[in-house]
């Protein structure tokens, strides 16, 4: 597990404690909450980050309309169970033995049940739609400049392979970033779109997870891009299984981030 060797810190995750007692005498950084060693050369999994947080909280449009199966994270923060690799376990339960199934980004995808609830596999979220509204500016941003800047951001800051940024849509003041990554496309070492989206979400909220770096300063041709609202939709490879009542009202349960 690599880290900045000189002073033993974790550039990609400030919610860690680092010490020089890893394999081979190298610096080893452990995520708060779980104590799992993390690879500081890449993003830490969302599950470990959530656990750490809980231990230390129109017609002819170019914009995408989320499908009927799109999930929004309405349940807020919880202390998740992570597997030995730091991924979400398919079944999550709270202290009162209420259980539910989650997808690979940790968002609930079934009704809540009891300890008898079975979640056979961790269903992959293969499509993430990040819906942003920016603050008023003198004029609209140039679409191609905006597209290039957001792609650069995901490539350089979050180390997400460019092929996983499927599209950037813009219809002032709404920006939509589409991330797509099927199980078959994700190679060993590839950053997961769910992790990249979570880092981006925290950056946008002014809660950067990076060690010692300043907050996110998004600029398009020198003009600040200030986000005033974020909404993230998650689409799974297998549609979620909610009761009809939940499905009918699902899109009214938007989770806004200011």
């Amino acid at each position: 597990h690599t880290a900045a060797q000189d002073n033993c810190t974790c550039p990609t995750n400030k919610m860690t404690v680092c010490s020089p007692d890893g394999p081979g005498g190298r610096c080893q950084c452990r995520a708060l909450g779980s104590g799992m060693a993390v690879d500081c050369s890449t993003l830490t999994s969302k599950c470990l980050l959530l656990k750490a947080r809980m231990s230390a909280p129109k017609n002819a449009r170019t914009l995408v309309r989320p499908s009927e199966h799109a999930l929004v994270d309405n349940d807020g923060l919880y202390d998740p169970d992570c597997d030995p690799e730091g991924r979400f376990k398919a079944r999550q339960c709270n202290q009162t033995s209420v259980c539910w199934c989650v997808n690979s980004v940790g968002v609930r995808r079934t009704d809540k049940g009891d300890l008898s609830l079975r979640c056979d596999e961790l269903v992959r979220t293969h499509h993430i739609l990040i819906d942003l509204r920016h603050r008023p500016t003198a004029g609209a941003f140039n679409h191609s400049d905006l597209d290039a800047e957001l792609r650069r951001l995901f490539r350089e800051r979050y180390r997400l392979h460019p092929k996983f940024v499927a599209a950037v849509h813009y219809e002032q003041p709404t920006i939509q970033i589409e991330l797509r990554q099927n199980t078959s496309q994700k190679a060993a070492g590839d950053v997961d779109i769910g992790d990249a989206a979570y880092y981006f979400e925290r950056d946008i909220k002014g809660e950067s997870l990076f060690q010692g770096r300043g907050g996110l300063d998004l600029r398009v041709r020198g003009e600040p891009l200030q986000v005033e609202r974020t909404l993230i939709y998650y689409l799974d490879e297998i549609p979620p299984k909610f009761s009809m009542k939940r499905l009918t009202h699902h899109h009214h349960h938007h989770h806004h981030h200011h």
Partner: antibody
Amino acid sequence: QVQLVQSGAEVKKPGASVKVSCKASGYSFTTHWIHWVRQAPGQGLEWIGTIFPSNAYAVYNQKFRDRATMTADRSISTAYIELSRLRSDDTAVYYCARASYFDYWGQGTTVTVSS
Amino acid sequence: EIVLTQSPATLSLSPGERATLSCRASQNIGTSIHWFQQKPGQSPRLLIKYASESISGIPSRFSGSGSGTDFTLTISSLEPEDFAVYYCQHSHSWPFTFGQGTKLEIK
């Protein structure tokens, strides 16, 4: 050379508290985890918890969370564990150890809980 | 929590023989396993870290192997001073846990 020196044996009554110290020398105290482990007579080793002296971040075994308190005084390179509401089954040798693989251990502190 | 199961509970061998001690983890822990020797009235002593890394001052007859869930401590040729209790411990995630120990006794 690295050394962890613990405080002396203690005899306590049930319901009382005990505080054991572990003085580190021969290395940078703030950069390594200090773990606390206990061993009841004739039994195996049991991890109580760990503290990172640099920022006093502490992690407890769930079993001890409500009764154990780990602290560290960086100025004198000493870690402490306090165990409250003692019971007879807390009778054990308490060890401090350094790093994730426990490369150096204190000599142990015998805590006897008896009425 | 991760459970470590050591086997056998007791191993009876003669000096000069080869000892093979096993430690099995309840889930994949990579190579985050460490081995200790403890003699009566003494603090445990680290023998092997991270499954197979040797420790300065520990005789070369002690070696470790394994990854994932199955780990082995091997003593190539037993010396009289090797008869003791051996523990494995993991540092994969909190809480850290120990195996219940293997007692190596003289046959």
